[in-house]
């Protein structure tokens, strides 16, 4: 029987800066029940805090609501593992909520072939922000990236979209099912998981791109 | 713990190249930005380049612009400084440097490692 | 380039003294965020630089309270209120708000 092995913070995640949470990972337990308090302080304040929430996030993990999240303000975070043998830390997390949104997939993902009288056919792809992202307050600027392949193409062609929420595609392979996702990602931030996937059929008269 | 170990440093001759690396433990790589930074013989310390944690944006000030480049890969928890072209006044000391900073660009150097010396001499 | 000038380059000082380093930057290092990317490291002999101060006034880790930074814009101060035989060692600024980034010269911290 032993103190508690090292635990480590390894991520932590906002849907939207107005709310985040972080994981961590316990080290070996040393055989005896442990607890886990994962405790933090904002940059210029020597007053510690106790997490506010241990359940939203799942086990070992941390969830800081909206009355408890600043952008632009460094939390500094540590977790103690404790059992009836000693204690152990964790190394100290400096985190920034602005840097680590992560954005809900785009939504409402549409996709249909315009064949033009006059013009060359093409994919149009349309999408939806994610519900909890809020553009209108100029916080957030939202990157967007399309993938798609036929359905036994084992390679994903790629584009990057911009902040823009529609898409034109000209180049596609007459007869054949596509799928096509969408993802977003913030000017500061990760990816987003890819939207699920929707799935056109290209008409065997669609004519190919010069 | 987070250790920083660089290695790859020696002498080499004047427009002569090299290959710094920086192995990495103790915290989640792929997470952080990076940095070399160099101490000349005099002492004074200057900033090299840094990198963004996927490895997808890098910058380097004028001096070692378009001679060196900087590199992760995320996968073997390692950075790499290679430098070609090298002149005399490269000689120095590199450190490489985690932020302090879980992910975003900016922010301090909060660890270093214990530096690898390069000297360019004919 | 922000040109970040220190000042004095040698600080002989007595153990249990106060001691007070200038760092002045060229231009205002004010980030288009609002934040103020000033830092001060410690490069004792033989050693790699550690981090002290991280945004003009944020002590690192481990850091004891006898030091503190401050200033703003362009003009900014660290105090190690009581020098202890630990802290002797060369100090330097950093400005990290533009790139590139840049160190000032250095300030030796020498028992007089």
């Known amino acids: 029987q032993l103190p508690p092995g090292k635990p480590e913070i390894f991520k932590c995640r906002s849907p939207n800066k107005e709310t985040f949470t972080c994981w961590w990972r316990p080290g070996t337990d040393g055989g005896l029940p442990t607890n886990y308090s994962l405790t933090y302080h904002r940059e210029g304040e020597t007053l510690m805090h106790e997490c506010p929430d241990y359940i939203t996030g799942g086990p070992n993990s941390c969830h800081f609501g909206k009355q408890y999240t600043s952008m632009w303000r460094t939390y500094i975070m540590m977790v103690n593992a404790t059992n009836q043998m000693g204690s152990s830390f964790s190394d100290e997390l400096y985190v920034d909520v602005t840097y680590i949104v992560q954005p809900d997939p785009p939504l409402e993902l549409a996709v249909e072939v315009k064949q033009p009288e006059d013009r060359k056919p093409y994919l149009w792809i349309k999408w939806s922000p994610p519900t909890l992202i809020d553009l209108k307050t100029g916080w957030f600027t939202l990157l967007y990236e399309i993938r798609l392949k036929p359905e036994k193409a084992a390679e994903w062609e790629i584009h990057f979209a911009g902040q823009q929420t529609e898409f034109k595609i000209l180049s596609l392979h007459p007869g054949q099912k596509y799928l096509v996702q969408v993802r977003c990602k913030p000017d500061h931030g990760y990816w987003s998981a890819w939207s699920p996937a929707t799935f056109i059929q290209i008409p065997s008269d669609f004519t190919m791109n010069d | 713990e987070v250790k920083l170990v660089e290695s790859g440093g020696g002498l080499v001759q004047p427009g002569g190249s090299l290959k710094l690396s920086c192995a990495a433990s103790g915290f989640t790589f792929s997470d952080y930005y990076m940095f070399w930074v160099r101490q000349t013989p005099e002492k004074s310390l200057e900033w090299v380049a840094y990198?963004?944690?996927?490895?997808?944006?890098?910058y380097y000030p004028d001096t070692v612009k378009g001679r060196f480049t900087i590199s992760r890969d995320n996968a073997k928890n390692t950075l790499y400084l290679q430098m070609s072209r090298l002149k005399s006044e490269d000689t120095a000391m590199y450190y490489c440097?985690?932020?302090?900073?879980?992910?975003?660009?900016?922010?301090?150097?909060?660890?270093w490692g214990q530096g690898t010396s390069v000297t360019v001499s004919s | 380039d922000v040109l970040m000038t220190q000042t004095p380059l040698s600080l002989p000082v007595s153990l249990g003294d106060q001691a007070s380093i200038s760092c002045r930057s060229s231009q205002s290092i004010v980030h288009s965020n609002g934040n103020t990317y000033l830092e001060w490291y410690l490069q004792k002999p033989g050693q790699s630089p550690k981090l002290l101060i991280y945004k003009v006034s944020n002590r690192f880790s481990g850091v004891p309270d006898r030091f503190s930074g401050s200033g703003s814009g362009t003009d900014f101060t660290l105090k190690i209120s009581r020098v202890e035989a630990e802290d002797l060692g060369v100090y330097y600024c950093f400005q990290g708000s533009h790139v590139p980034f840049t160190f000032g010269s250095g300030t030796k911290l020498e028992i007089k």
């Open positions: 440097s985690r932020q302090l900073f879980y992910y975003g660009s900016r922010g301090a150097m909060g660890y």
């Open positions: 990198i963004s944690n996927g490895g997808g944006s890098t």
